[in-house]
């Protein structure tokens, strides 16, 4: 496991990053601010009723590259954007839901989801 701030770990930040959190605040957050060794994120996804829900928060360094890659999930419309360039940088992230395609409704059990690419902000 990489130590915080070690020079041998190119992706590790030398200092903690503070992020805005909403619907996704861990116990160690204060005043809707969380802390991480990884990324801030903002995500939009549909809830069970199809209503868009925006959440934001912190992603730890371990596994965050994968989470920020925004791999499409079958039967779920969602998009995530991540950033690290300054504290609370996720206040300025505004991901949008990938558009519904006609074939999402007519293809039966096989859904070809639109792959939304997010942008890393460094």
């Amino acid at each position: 496991k990489k130590e915080d701030g070690e020079s041998t770990a190119p992706t590790a930040r030398p200092k903690v990053l503070r992020c805005k959190c909403h619907h996704h605040c861990p116990e160690d957050s204060v005043n809707n601010i969380c802390s991480t060794d990884g990324y801030c994120f903002t995500m939009i996804e549909e809830d069970d009723s199809g209503t868009p829900v925006v959440t934001s928060g912190c992603l730890g360094l371990e596994g965050s590259d994968f989470q920020c890659r925004d791999t499409p999930i079958p039967h779920q419309r969602r998009s995530i954007e991540c950033c690290t360039e300054r504290n609370e940088c996720n206040k300025d992230l505004h991901p949008t839901l990938p558009p519904l395609k006609d074939r999402d409704f007519v293809d039966g059990p096989i859904h070809h989801k639109h792959h939304h690419h997010h942008h890393h902000h460094h």
Epitope: D4, G5, P14, K15, E27, V30, D37, G38, C58
Partner: antibody
Framework: QVQLQQPGAELVKPGASVKLSCKAS????????MQWVKQRPGQGLEWIGE????????LYNQKFKGKATLTVDTSSSTAYMQLSSLTSEDSAVYFC?????????WGQGTTLTVSS | DVVMTQTPLSLPVSLGDQASISCRSS???????????LHWYLQKPGQSPKLLIY???NRFSGVPDRFSGSGSGTDFTLKISRVEAEDLGVYFC?????????FGSGTKLEIK
């Protein structure tokens, strides 16, 4: 090597304000947070707050909100803490400290005496 | 705020002895990232504190291997295997998991 230089002492009158300085050298100033810690004899260490020199983002201990204001001057790699409306309770040693995920290096501390 | 309780307040030892200092936190110090931000510092008279151990058990650069840290959750220990004269001073534990960051009240290591 990492150095955090602080003036040795400050003498200030009650009700006045004081701006304590902390000059950093030996590392990239904007790559680490700067924290400030208060130490009174027999009272242990108290965390005042922190500032990220890269964007001047601050976090304060609720107890010191309105008392302490943290700023930086990146051109001189210097962090400042202004303390206002001073009383005898503010007499203490104040340390600045470099922080990544924990305090790695401390300044020598400034002894602040509030007295008329 | 997280309260850090250190015991004992004073620890008289003979040179060469082992010393053990306990630090308990009022809530878990496991951060949401999985790290535990519990650290140990030594402050000698008239000096600023110096970092000994970070994140429970990692020795900071230049710290002799007679210093070791252990523990998890809310219960932590600093051990000095063979106390030397230069080890005397006040030891503080500190947490940087929860804002505001807090410190233990200190343990004074002194000669018996």
């Amino acid at each position: 090597q990492v150095q955090l230089q602080q003036p040795g002492a400050e003498l200030v009158k009650p009700g006045a304000s004081v701006k304590l300085s902390c000059k950093a050298s030996g590392y990239t100033f904007t790559s680490y947070w700067m924290q400030w810690v208060k130490q009174r004899p027999g009272q242990g260490l108290e965390w005042i707050g922190e500032i990220d020199p890269s964007d001047s983002y601050t976090l304060y201990n609720q107890k010191f909100k309105g008392k302490a204001t943290l700023t930086v001057d990146t051109s001189s790699s210097t962090a400042y803490m202004q303390l206002s409306s001073l009383t005898s309770e503010d007499s203490a040693v104040y340390f600045c400290a470099r922080f990544g995920y924990y305090i790695e290096y401390w300044g020598q501390g400034t002894t602040l005496t509030v007295s008329s | 705020d997280v309260v850090m309780t250190q015991t004992p307040l004073s620890l008289p030892v003979s040179l060469g002895d082992q010393a053990s200092i306990s630090c308990r936190s009022s809530q878990s110090l496991v951060h949401s990232t999985g790290n535990t931000y519990l650290h140990w510092y030594l402050q000698k008279p008239g000096q600023s504190p110096k970092l000994l151990i970070y994140k429970v058990s990692n020795r900071f650069s230049g710290v002799p291997d007679r210093f070791s840290g252990s523990g998890s959750g809310t219960d932590f220990t600093l051990k000095i295997s063979r106390v030397e004269a230069e080890d005397l001073g006040v030891y503080f534990c500190s947490q940087s998991t929860h804002v505001p960051f807090t410190f233990g009240s200190g343990t004074k290591l002194e000669i018996k």
